[in-house]
C-alpha cells in the first residue's frame, strides 16, 4: 500500500470512558493535526476508516461494526459505543484515505470501572471557586451530541455519594449545579448522572468533577514572610550548624508565579564562599494558599560567616516581599574555674 | 565556569519519542529551578517548561502538556526533557537554561530537534 | 495567558544612534519583565530583569523602564555588537511568555 502519513500515538488525548455508557469519539485527525474538516474531506472523496489494537496485543484488527444492537458504529467523524465494555480498552487509530492520499493517528481509549459512589481511575478536571464570592455556576460535561435537542434527559447530581436535595448553598437546576457563596466545605467530588431514551432503550452518562474552593481575587496580596523575623535571632558558636528557614505565606492567586530565594550579602549564594546546602518544600491549605520554604544550611559556620547578611527575599504576582534573618556569633562566657583559678595566681 | 550542555537532541519520526538531557556545572544545582526553552528555526523564543530547584514543582505550556516530561536527578547535576508523541511542530532548537527568580540567567549552546513527517 | 506584544518589529538604525524598543503586555505583570539579546547563532542573554535592573556585565548604555503593561529598552548609543533579535519576556505569571522580538539592524 501507498505510504501513510502517520500522526502517531496521540498521548494528549488518553481518552477515558466509563464502562456500560455510550461514548462518542471524534477522530482527532480533523480536531488537531488537519486543516480541514470531516465534510470537506468527505466532500472531496476521501474516506475515513477505523480501526483498533486490542490492550496488551500488538495486531491491528479492524473494528466490527455488525454487533448486535449496532453497539460499535460510526458517524461522520464520530466513533460510537451503545455502550462500551470493559474488553473495548485500547488503541484506536482513524485513518483518511483515497487512492492517492493517506493521513492516520491513533490514540488511547480505556474503559474504566466506577463503583457505586462514582470512585473510579477516571482523571477528574477541577473546577475552582472563589470563596465566599457570588454565585458560581458548574455544568455537567461532554454531555452534547450524546441526544438530541428535543430529548429532555433526567439529570441527577450527587457530592460524593449523596444526592444533592435541600442542601444549603448548592442548588442543581438541569445540566447545571449553581453554588451560592461558595464554602471550603463544598470541596469535593461532585457528579451528574444523566439519563435519557434512546431507540427504546435506556441509557446513563456518569460525569464525575472535582469542586476546589479557592482563595478570592479580592483577597490576593503580596507574599507574607514567616520565617526569619525580627523576634528570632540566630546565635552560633563558630563551628556550629547554622540553619535558617525562609518561610513564606502566597496566597492564592489564579496561575501567579510565586517565589523565593535567599542572598548572602546582596549576592546569589553561589556568588559567595560559603558551603551552603538550600532545600525546598512547598504545602498547600485547603484553599490553595501556598506555603513555601527554603532551608538555608552552613553545616560549620564560620565568625565570617556569622557577619554576612542573610535576606529571605519573595514575590508573586501582586508584588513582593524580603526579611533578613538576625544573625550572631555567640558570646562565650569565661569558663569560670580555671580563669577564676588563674586568678588567684594558681598555675 | 557556570555551564550547561544540552545533549540528546537528533531527527525522529513524528509520533516518536526522544530523551533531552542537561549537563550543569559551576553552580550548586539544586538551589535553581531549570527550564526548557525552545526555538523553531527563524521564529522567536517560546517557553517549554519549568522545575523547581527540589523537582517537586513542575509547570508546562499548553502545546506539550501531557506529552513532555521534565525532570532533574540533583544527585547528578542534570536535567532531563521526555518528549513523546512528537510532531512536526517541534522541531526547534531546545535550551537549557537555569531559571534564577528574576530571569533565565544561564544558557545552554541549545540542542537541536527535527521531527520528520 | 498574558500575550506580549513588541514593537516595531524590525528597527534600522545606525551605530551612535538611540533605540527605543517596547513591549506592552495584555494585562499587568508588575514589574516582572526581563529583556533577552540575541544574536545569530547563539543562545540568548539576559540584559534587563525586572523591568529596569541590568544584569551582571552588561553595558552602562543598556536601560530598561516600565511597570505594569508598558515597558522599554533603551539602548544610548549603538554599538556595532548590539545589532540583533531582542526580547521580552514575563514572569509574574504561568505559563512565562516572551514576546515575538524585535529585530534591531544596522541601517
Known amino acids: 500500500s501507498e505510504r501513510c502519513d502517520d500522526w502517531g500515538l496521540d498521548t494528549m488525548r488518553q481518552i477515558q470512558v466509563f464502562e456500560d455508557e455510550p461514548a462518542r469519539i471524534k477522530c482527532p485527525l480533523f480536531e488537531h493535526f488537519l486543516k480541514y474538516n470531516y465534510s470537506t474531506a468527505h466532500s472531496s472523496g476521501l474516506t475515513l476508516i477505523w480501526y483498533w489494537t486490542r490492550q496488551d496485543r500488538d495486531l491491528e484488527e479492524p473494528i466490527n461494526f455488525r454487533l448486535p444492537e449496532n453497539r460499535i458504529s460510526k458517524e461522520k467523524d464520530v466513533l460510537w459505543f451503545r455502550p462500551t465494555l470493559l474488553n473495548d480498552t485500547g488503541n484506536y487509530t482513524c485513518m483518511l484515505r483515497n487512492t492517492t492520499y493517506c493521513s492516520k493517528v491513533a490514540f488511547p481509549l480505556e474503559v474504566v470501572q466506577k463503583d457505586s459512589c462514582f470512585n473510579s481511575p477516571m482523571r477528574l478536571p477541577v473546577h475552582r471557586l472563589y470563596i465566599e464570592q457570588g454565585i458560581h455556576n458548574i455544568t455537567c460535561p461532554n454531555v452534547d451530541g450524546y441526544f438530541p435537542s428535543s430529548v429532555k434527559p433526567s439529570v441527577t447530581w450527587y457530592k460524593g455519594c449523596t444526592e444533592i436535595v435541600n442542601f444549603h448553598n448548592v442548588q442543581p437546576k438541569g445540566m447545571n449545579l449553581s453554588f451560592f457563596i461558595p464554602l471550603v466545605s463544598n470541596n469535593g467530588n461532585y457528579t451528574c448522572v444523566v439519563t435519557y431514551l434512546e431507540n427504546g432503550r435506556l441509557f446513563h452518562l456518569t460525569r464525575t468533577m472535582t469542586v476546589k474552593v479557592v482563595g478570592s481575587p479580592k483577597d490576593a496580596v503580596p507574599p507574607h514572610i514567616y520565617s526569619p523575623n525580627d523576634r528570632v535571632v540566630y546565635e552560633k558558636e563558630p563551628g556550629e550548624e547554622l540553619v535558617i528557614p525562609c518561610k513564606v505565606y502566597f496566597s492564592f492567586i489564579m496561575d501567579s508565579h510565586n517565589e523565593i530565594w535567599w542572598t548572602i550579602d546582596g549576592k546569589k549564594p553561589d556568588d559567595v564562599p560559603v558551603d551552603i546546602t538550600i532545600i525546598e518544600s512547598v504545602s498547600y491549605s485547603s484553599t490553595e494558599d501556598e506555603t513555601r520554604t527554603q532551608i538555608l544550611s552552613i553545616k560549620k559556620v564560620t565568625p565570617e560567616d556569622l557577619k554576612r547578611n542573610y535576606v529571605c527575599h519573595a514575590r508573586n504576582a501582586e508584588g513582593e516581599a524580603e526579611q533578613a534573618a538576625k544573625v550572631k556569633q555567640k558570646v562565650i562566657p569565661p569558663r569560670y574555674t580555671v580563669e577564676l583559678a588563674c586568678g588567684f595566681g594558681a598555675t | 565556569e557556570v555551564q550547561l550542555l544540552e545533549s540528546g537532541g537528533g531527527l525522529v519520526q513524528r509520533g516518536g519519542s526522544l530523551r533531552l538531557s542537561c549537563a550543569a556545572s559551576g553552580f550548586t544545582f539544586s538551589s535553581y529551578a531549570m527550564s526548557w526553552v525552545r526555538q523553531a528555526p527563524g521564529k522567536g523564543l517560546e517557553w517549554v517548561s519549568s522545575?523547581?530547584?527540589?523537582?517537586?514543582?513542575?509547570n508546562y505550556a499548553d502545546s506539550v502538556k501531557g506529552r513532555f516530561t521534565i525532570s532533574r536527578d540533583n544527585s547528578k547535576n542534570t536535567l532531563h526533557l521526555q518528549m513523546n508523541s512528537l510532531r512536526a511542530e517541534d522541531t526547534a532548537v531546545y535550551y537549557c537554561?537555569?531559571?534564577?527568580?528574576?530571569?533565565?540567567?544561564?544558557w545552554g549552546h541549545g540542542t537541536t530537534v527535527t521531527v520528520s513527517s | 495567558e498574558i500575550v506580549l506584544t513588541q514593537s516595531p518589529a524590525t528597527l534600522s538604525l545606525s551605530p551612535g544612534e538611540r533605540a527605543t524598543l517596547s513591549c506592552r503586555a495584555s494585562q499587568s505583570v508588575n514589574s516582572y519583565l526581563a529583556w533577552y539579546q540575541q544574536k545569530p547563532g547563539q543562545a540568548p542573554r539576559l540584559l534587563i530583569y525586572?523591568?529596569?535592573n541590568r544584569a551582571t556585565g552588561i553595558p552602562a548604555r543598556f536601560s530598561g523602564s516600565g511597570s505594569g503593561t508598558d515597558f522599554t529598552l533603551t539602548i544610548s548609543s549603538l554599538e556595532p555588537e548590539d545589532f540583533a533579535v531582542y526580547y521580552c519576556q514575563q514572569r509574574s505569571y504561568w505559563p512565562i511568555t516572551f514576546g515575538q522580538g524585535t529585530r534591531l539592524e544596522i541601517k
Open positions: 522545575i523547581s530547584g527540589s523537582g517537586d514543582s513542575t
Open positions: 537554561v537555569r531559571d534564577y527568580y528574576y530571569g533565565m540567567d544561564v
Open positions: 525586572d523591568a529596569s
